[in-house]
């Protein structure tokens, strides 16, 4: 969490941002809140990015002002206009690119004063893994697949019954570059699995950690998966 204060002649206002991660090829949100004002026309929001000449986005007098927007953000940004009045200056970013990573500044002017806070935005790719029984294999085998990751993650298998066991000798992981030549498909195969056991395929990079679980019994197969972003820190 980054909390910034204004330092102008006018009073300072508190601006709060939260570091976050964007998923390449999806929409992202850069979070920023501030002490609200009673008049929308008195609020100015400016989003800036370190190393970028033009503005990322500007909102003033109740609407977007795009004349100074940098080329790399054209047609890709919007604030939640109906929530500005309650102090939400968060920016929606369309079609996140690897190059969107960096340090952003959320700068606010209201009738109460000015304030700003920085935000670290990481970009990469992360997706939910799906674990299935591979019926084509000669022995009982599990196949864990996740369609989009970047940077290249690590893949670790674990089991409920054999806690702490190292499965690296009985697993094989491959990474296949996707068509846009950035993200990769992750495929990991675990051999010699036993029934009545729960196996977990854990995929992790510096942005996200995802787990796919599978429980195989004689009568049924149960699956569960979840994903957690690793770098959401508030400022």
């Amino acid at each position: 969490l980054i909390i910034g204060f204004g330092i102008s002649g006018r009073h300072s206002i508190t601006v709060t941002t939260v570091a976050s991660a964007g998923n390449i090829g999806e929409d992202g949100i850069l979070s920023c809140t501030f002490e609200p004002d009673i008049k929308l026309s008195d609020i100015v929001i400016q989003w800036l990015k370190e190393g970028v000449l033009g503005l990322v986005h500007e909102f003033k007098e109740g609407k977007d002002e795009l004349s100074e927007q940098d080329e790399m953000f054209r047609g890709r940004t919007a604030v939640f206009a109906d929530q500005v009045i309650v102090g939400n200056a968060s920016l929606r970013l369309k079609n996140v690119q690897l190059t969107d990573a960096g340090t952003y500044k959320c700068y606010i002017i209201t009738s109460k004063g000015k304030g700003n806070a920085n935000l670290e935005y990481k970009t990469g790719a992360f997706s939910m893994p799906e674990v299935n029984v591979d019926y084509n294999a000669s022995s009982e085998t599990l196949r864990c697949e996740a369609p989009r990751w970047f940077p290249q993650p690590t893949v670790v298998w674990a089991s409920q019954v054999d806690q702490g066991a190292n499965f690296s000798e009985v697993s094989n992981t491959s990474f296949e570059l996707n068509s846009e030549n950035v993200t990769m498909k992750v495929v990991s195969v675990l051999y010699n699995v036993t029934i009545n056991n729960t196996y977990s395929c854990m995929i992790e990079n510096d942005i996200a950690k995802a787990t796919g679980d599978i429980k195989v019994t004689e009568s049924e197969i149960k699956r569960r998966s979840h994903l957690q972003l690793l770098n959401s820190k508030a400022s």
Epitope: G25, G75, A78, E180
Partner: antibody, heavy 120, light 107 residues
């Protein structure tokens, strides 16, 4: 050659449901945002919804929010529009359209459309 | 929501004449304005992107101008195949809106 072929249109009663499909070929489907745009008889174009290249992000026009669901299957190169709680005013030709790759928000390729008629 | 207003609703001209179609946005959209042509029974076709940028395969007689709230599509010398409906589209935000269209008909 880029091709977008819509299907699934037809006659449906008010309150009913319908699923439209759009089969894409001639380009790397999984790299592009895709949209549905509709056109009521004798009227102008109305953007309906978009879905991100990976399928994880969607955005809808206010007129269909909560009733329509856009999705995609990149393995099948297919875009979908699940329409429910249909109203007479949803009667239109529905086009699937590809958004520009570099900077979105304009449509460089369109399908020929599929007709949806909502009537009792 | 940004409202796009096109004028005139109908424009009657003869082949060889110059056509000027207007589009106005309810608020400034910089140059985030795109133009499409639609013929009866066909899908729309992209003509101009970002107010004035030409599209590969589109004849040079089609040009666009404007910024902020006021935009113009110009067809320098009308060909018979140019008679169609023309739409402008706001491309600045997430909720994409079209104008109601200008029908270009033969006089």
């Amino acid at each position: 050659e880029v091709q977008l072929v819509e299907s699934g249109g037809g006659l449906v009663q008010p309150g009913g449901s319908l699923r439209l499909s759009c089969a894409a070929s001639g380009f790397t489907f999984s790299n592009y945002y895709m949209s549905w745009v509709r056109q009521a008889p004798g009227k102008g174009l109305e953007w309906v919804a978009y879905v991100s290249s990976g399928g994880g992000s969607t955005y809808y026009s206010d007129s269909v929010k909560g009733r329509f669901t856009i999705s995609r299957d990149n393995a099948k190169n297919t875009l979908y529009l699940q329409m429910s709680s249909l109203r007479a005013e949803d009667t239109a030709v529905y086009y699937c359209a590809r958004e520009s790759y570099s900077q979105g928000n304009y449509f460089d390729y369109w399908g020929q459309g599929t007709t949806v008629t909502v009537s009792s | 929501e940004i409202v796009m207003t096109q004028s005139p609703a109908t424009l009657s001209l003869s082949p060889g004449e110059r056509a000027t179609l207007s589009c106005r946005a309810s608020q400034s959209i910089s140059d985030y304005l795109h133009w499409y042509q639609q013929k009866p029974g066909q899908a729309p076709r992209l003509l101009i992107k970002f107010a004035s940028q030409s599209i590969s395969g589109i004849p040079a007689r089609f040009s666009g101008s404007g910024s902020g709230t006021d935009f113009t599509l110009t067809i320098s010398s009308l060909e018979p195949e140019d008679f169609a409906v023309y739409y402008c589209q706001n491309g600045h935000s997430f909720s994409l809106t079209f104008g109601q269209g200008t029908k270009l008909e033969i006089k």
